[in-house]
Amino acid sequence: MAVTACQGLGFVVSLIGIAGIIAATCMDQWSTQDLYNNPVTAVFNYQGLWRSCVRESSGFTECRGYFTLLGLPAMLQAVRALMIVGIVLGAIGLLVSIFALKCIRIGSMEDSAKANMTLTSGIMFIVSGLCAIAGVSVFANMLVTNFWMSTANMYTGMGGMVQTVQTRYTFGAALFVGWVAGGLTLIGGVMMCIACRGLAPEETNYKAVSYHASGHSVAYKPGGFKASTGFGSNTKNKKIYDGGARTEDEVQSYPSKHDYV
């Protein structure tokens, strides 16, 4: 029960995290115009990974995409790559984790397979979260560097009455969304990895006893095959109960401790 809860919670937390990473990547507010020198600006500028926008007091907003690829800073390209890798890994992780969920029955999938899938998705979520955190942090570092550089050059163009104030940019909402989302994805991944340990099936050997209807000879087969999942996958192995010859399919009427409900 605890394993199912941990796995389910990990999945939900990762899902929220990945949705957040996607939202952050698409958001235009990665950097926003610093209003320290002009808190009453009538024109406000903010920038995302894909476009730059200007919002006027009038309510009019104009956005322009970065239509060049080679002309963009390498750091911006790196951030884009990290965020996309994070999204792709997260999406694959989500897909894998859906099939790995203990509460979902898929064919005759064994516990070991579910455990492996849970671990795989967990690792994917962890890497996805780290990619997002790294991407956002690289962008934040770029902003901080540029902020202090532009502060140093703030009034270099001042001559007489005319001031040419350089526009500075500060952290936008997308950075905080990205950090939180990356953190959630990371936590979700860790939870999935923890759940994986609980999902790994115990290597209990069940002795299969084979009876003949006549009752003359008794053959004992040392065990080695695990209890069936209830989907009739093991028809070759015959177990005979109470002197009646019935296949394993017919016997499995009640769920065993390894069944997925």
């Epitope: 115009q33 600006t41 024109v43 920038q47 200007v54 007091s57 009019f60």
Partner: antibody
Framework: EVQLVESGGGLVQPGGSLRLSCAAS????????MAWVRQAPGKGLEWVAF????????YYVDTVTGRFTISRDNAKNSLYLQMNSLRAEDTAVYYC???????????WGQGTLVTVSS | DIVMTQSPDSLAVSLGERATINCKSS????????????LTWYQQKPGQPPKLLIY???TRESGVPDRFSGSGSGTDFTLTISSLQAEDVAVYYC?????????FGGGTKVEIK
């Protein structure tokens, strides 16, 4: 046709109060920011106050901050300017104007004269 | 506050001649994000409210004759009337549309010589 009609102007003593109104028609009032601009007799234009379409962004010129209050009622298609502690230098024709793309005032009312004198 | 300085204060031009009005701002009105200059020009005829002529430094408002043109960037701007008509007699104001308070220039009175 866009129309802006100001009212409420008149003669008032220094320290007194006055409330100007602007009735808007011919456009979706709630989609636009609005502004008040004044012009002292024989002088140039002076922007007084701005209010955005949903009334959460409001700005005033320093000389009227704390004395004047701009407000709007989108249900009534009306803009208001509450003027308190009036001074002689507030004497002017007050224009109500529609604020639009480019942070410009594209339509103006005919104005209402406010005279502050003892 | 951004100070807007217009020159000359008044201007007398013959009909059909070119009229040029200058406007200088104390700070750059160029918004880097969209590369637009937030400088607006208004025309005010006697006894009338102002009329919007040009915004974003050079974009003509619809219905404004093409003899009116705006130019300039950063802190220096110009309004040009290529061929002055009798109906162009008015006071012209430039306005900072970039930052509050939205300051106006002192105005330039255009008359016929």
């Amino acid at each position: 046709e866009v129309q802006l009609v100001e009212s409420g102007g008149g003669l008032v003593q220094p320290g007194g109060s006055l409330r100007l109104s602007c009735a808007a028609s011919g456009f979706t009032f709630s989609d636009y920011g609005m502004a008040w601009v004044r012009q002292a007799p024989g002088k140039g234009l002076e922007w007084v106050a701005f209010i955005n379409n949903l009334a959460y962004s409001i700005y005033y010129v320093d000389t009227v901050t704390g004395r004047f209050t701009i407000s709007r009622d989108n249900a009534k298609n009306s803009l208001y300017l509450q003027m308190n502690s009036l001074r002689a230098e507030d004497t002017a024709v007050y224009y109500c104007a529609r604020f639009t793309t480019g942070n410009v005032m594209d339509y103006w009312g005919q104005g209402t004269l406010v005279t502050v004198s003892s | 506050d951004i100070v807007m300085t217009q020159s000359p204060d008044s201007l007398a031009v013959s009909l059909g001649e070119r009229a040029t009005i200058n406007c200088k701002s104390s700070q750059s009105l160029l918004q880097g994000g969209n590369q637009k200059n937030y400088l607006t020009w208004y025309q005010q005829k006697p006894g009338q409210p102002p009329k919007l002529l040009i915004y974003w430094s050079s974009t003509r408002e619809s219905g404004v004759p093409d003899r009116f043109s705006g130019s300039g960037s950063g802190t220096d701007f110009t309004l040009t009337i290529s061929s002055l008509q009798a109906e162009d007699v008015a006071v012209y104001y430039c306005q900072n549309s970039y930052s509050y308070p939205l300051t106006f220039g002192g105005g330039t009175k255009v008359e016929i010589k």
